[in-house]
Interface confidence: low
């Protein structure tokens, strides 16, 4: 007899893990055998589904690779012509062990801002996510809080925040871990030290400090009246992401020194700044009948003549005093590239050091010229043939300009050390054997104009440039 | 077959370092995680280090880390162990193993047969 | 770290006699421990997986069970194959951690 179709195992809810098996069985008694069609969410099922298979005259439903997308409500409907059909309906739910879709990376943040470590998950049931800084779970605290993606947020973010974070994924499937990260915290370039002013007396030595410190480490530069410092000797040190800077100067002149700490943070760079005052007690600017002021020798071409850290009077009555008689010596020198090797040294000392003259600090700086004597043992033993040739040329008006007269001193004009030994400047440089005498270009006269004082005997066979030697 | 061979042990000054290989075969080396396992004359097992199987990422226990260095290299199917500033307390049978995932975390499936380094002066 | 304390260290039993051991968790592990057998020189074999899966190809008499963090390996019917030592392995923690392990001898 014709028999109205009823679903004797109704169907129920199924568990199925992502890629694994998940069948539905829809009994059904029926006469005649009754046609059984298969919806999820309502949505017919197609029977040529490679997804599914439908066995047992459709009353197994498999689905032969569970994915994500395949959650629903599944139904099956059984209708042979008697009766109405019939309907059943359960559930799939797809059971998910946890996986990170987006894991945390490496942060580099600035301290006191927000960091956010992401971390979003898939499970099902949802996993809850925690994370772990080094070895250790992490405490959430009215700083660090866990948002509700399980992402980590961070606020006002501290030094001792850095280190390494992931995140752990877990439902009652399974536990997720994501790769380890790095939070670096950078901190802006600070200045835990200034430099402190002072007020010295012209020509003390003064050390300036300057600490800092910052992440990654600062640079320290110092600033010289706006210009970057060009003398004096820099000391640095670091230790625990503090440097220590220290500034050693010479002081001839007032300063504003500028200690300037920097580093970088990706693109951008971050700086801090402090400043400190060099006054000189009494000293006053060079005045109109001051010819010039004392300083140290900054230049290049007299650098291996005269003494280290000299000092040099340079003449105001240029506009640039320092660039103008760099100038004159370079000129000049450059004239001294044919002359004898016995000669060219003994030159070289005698034009620095009339350019340059030492200078005499005080309220009024004063430049001490080259004592006669020495200028003679120039002129008339060392380069006595090159001397006539340059007087020649000078007279027949060979050079291209005055600045040559300027270069060579008229020696009968300047002080002799006989006469007060502080008011003229010796030329330590010079300094040859008495016995090796006749091998210099001959005299211009039988005896020189001026007794030439007695130059100290070296073991050198020919003349030398030495500052260790000195005429007394 | 699966198979792991180790190779690389042997007597070792203390502080010395010693690089172990383990030698895969018989499935698809890429695919898994592999980690080393150590155990001690006459004690238990004790696990060392793991490695992702693209190498993303490595664990290692507090006893070993900051010495032993963990790597692979999955064109060659092979799994190394460099260990550096060797103790004496480093000495035992060394084991490579592979992690097979299953519905509750990983365990291991195969071992080899072992490596034995022995760290004495 | 997780500790895995197995119970007991030693155990003396007969031929067919039925044999259970134990292992606690320092904390849940789910369902993630793993049992293996290891006999003198030779390397550890995995009998039991997540808990309760009996690996491929080894005898029905070995069982696991248990959740959370207590657990345990019986052996219904001990075969004179069986005398072994014992170690529980969890992986809850990427930092996996074995028991100190259970020696099984002949009584």
């Known amino acids: 007899l014709p028999k109205a179709p009823v679903i004797t195992t109704p169907l129920e809810t199924v568990d199925a893990l992502v890629e694994e098996v998940a069948t539905f069985m829809c009994a059904v008694e029926s006469y005649p055998q009754p046609e059984i069609s298969w919806t999820r969410n309502k949505i017919l099922i197609k029977l040529f589904d490679t997804r599914y298979s439908i066995r047992e005259n459709g009353q197994l439903l498999t689905i032969l690779s569970v994915e994500d997308s395949d959650d629903g409500i599944y139904c099956c409907t059984a209708n042979n012509g008697v009766g109405g059909a019939v309907e059943s309906c359960g559930a799939l739910q797809v059971k998910m062990k946890p996986k990170i879709t987006r894991p945390p990376i490496n942060v580099k943040i600035i301290e006191g801002l927000k960091a956010v470590l992401p971390c979003t998950t898939m499970g099902n049931p949802k996993p809850s996510v925690s994370w772990i800084k080094g070895d250790s779970p992490l405490r959430e605290n009215s700083r660090i809080a866990v948002l509700e993606s399980g992402s980590l947020r961070i606020h006002n973010v501290q030094k001792e925040d850095a280190g390494q974070y992931r995140c752990v994924a877990k439902n009652s499937l399974g536990t997720a871990y994501s790769k380890v990260v790095k939070l670096e915290v950078e901190v802006f370039a600070r200045i835990l030290r200034a430099p402190e002013s002072h007020n010295v007396t012209f020509g003390s030595f003064v050390t300036l400090h300057c600490t800092a410190t910052g992440i990654p480490v600062p640079t320290i530069t110092w600033i010289e009246n706006g210009n970057a410092v060009s003398s004096g000797s820099i000391q640095e040190s670091v230790k625990d992401r503090v440097i220590d800077s220290r500034l050693q100067l010479f002081i001839t002149k007032p300063g504003l020194y500028t200690c300037i700490a920097t580093n970088k943070h990706g693109e951008k760079f971050s700086t801090a700044k402090a400043a400190a005052t060099i006054s000189i007690a009494e000293w006053s600017k060079p005045q109109k009948d001051n010819k010039g002021y004392c300083a140290q020798y900054r230049g290049e071409v007299c650098n291996a003549v005269l003494a280290k850290d000299a000092l040099v009077f340079l003449n105001t009555s240029y506009a640039d005093p320092e660039e103008a008689q760099e100038l004159l010596v370079h000129t000049a020198w450059n004239e001294l590239k044919v002359v004898s090797p016995v000669c060219r040294p003994a030159a070289e000392a005698l034009l620095c050091n009339h350019i340059f003259q030492e200078c005499s600090p005080g309220v009024v700086p004063t430049p001490i010229p080259i004592c006669r004597e020495y200028c003679l043992a120039v002129k008339e033993l060392f380069c006595a043939k090159e001397w006539l040739v340059m007087e020649e040329k000078t007279h027949r008006g060979l050079y291209r300009s005055e600045m040559h007269l300027l270069s060579v001193p008229e020696c009968s004009k300047l002080p002799s050390m006989h006469w007060d030994p502080t008011a003229c400047a010796r030329l330590p440089h010079l300094d040859y054997n008495k016995e090796n005498l006749k091998t210099f270009p001959p005299m211009t006269s039988s005896k020189p104009s001026v007794d030439i004082p007695n130059l100290p005997s070296s073991s050198s066979s020919s003349f030398s440039v030495s500052p260790t030697y000195s005429m007394t | 077959e699966v198979q792991l061979v180790e190779s690389g042990g042997g007597l070792v000054k203390p502080g010395g370092s010693l690089r172990l290989s383990c030698a895969a075969s018989?499935?698809?080396?890429?695919?898994?995680?592999m980690d080393w396992v150590r155990q001690a004359p006459g004690k238990g097992l004790e696990w060392v280090s793991s490695?992702?199987?693209?190498?993303?990422?490595?664990y290692y226990a507090d006893s070993v880390r900051g010495r032993f260095t963990i790597s692979r290299d999955n064109a060659k199917n092979s799994l190394y162990l460099q260990m550096n500033s060797l103790r004496a307390e480093d000495t035992a049978v060394y084991y490579c193993?592979?992690?097979?995932?299953?519905?509750?975390?990983?365990?291991?499936?195969?071992w080899g047969q072992g490596t034995l380094v022995t760290v004495s002066s | 770290d997780i500790q895995m304390t197995q119970s007991p260290s030693s155990l003396s039993a007969s031929v067919g006699d039925r044999v259970t051991i134990t292992c606690r968790a320092s904390?849940?592990?789910?369902?993630?421990v793993n049992w293996y057998q290891q006999k003198p020189g030779k390397a550890p074999k995995l009998l039991i997986y997540a808990a309760s899966t009996l690996q491929s190809g080894v005898p029905s008499r070995f069982s696991g069970s248990g959740s959370g963090t207590d657990f345990t390996l019986t052996i219904s019917s001990l075969q004179p194959e069986d005398f072994a030592t014992y170690y529980c392995q969890q992986s809850y923690s990427p930092l996996s951690t074995f028991g100190q392990g259970t020696k099984l001898e002949i009584k």
């Open positions: 904390q849940k592990v789910n369902k993630y």
């Open positions: 018989g499935f698809t080396f890429s695919s898994y995680t």
């Open positions: 490695i992702g199987s693209n190498g993303d990422y490595i």
């Open positions: 193993a592979r992690g097979q995932l299953a519905v509750a975390g990983t365990h291991f499936d195969y």
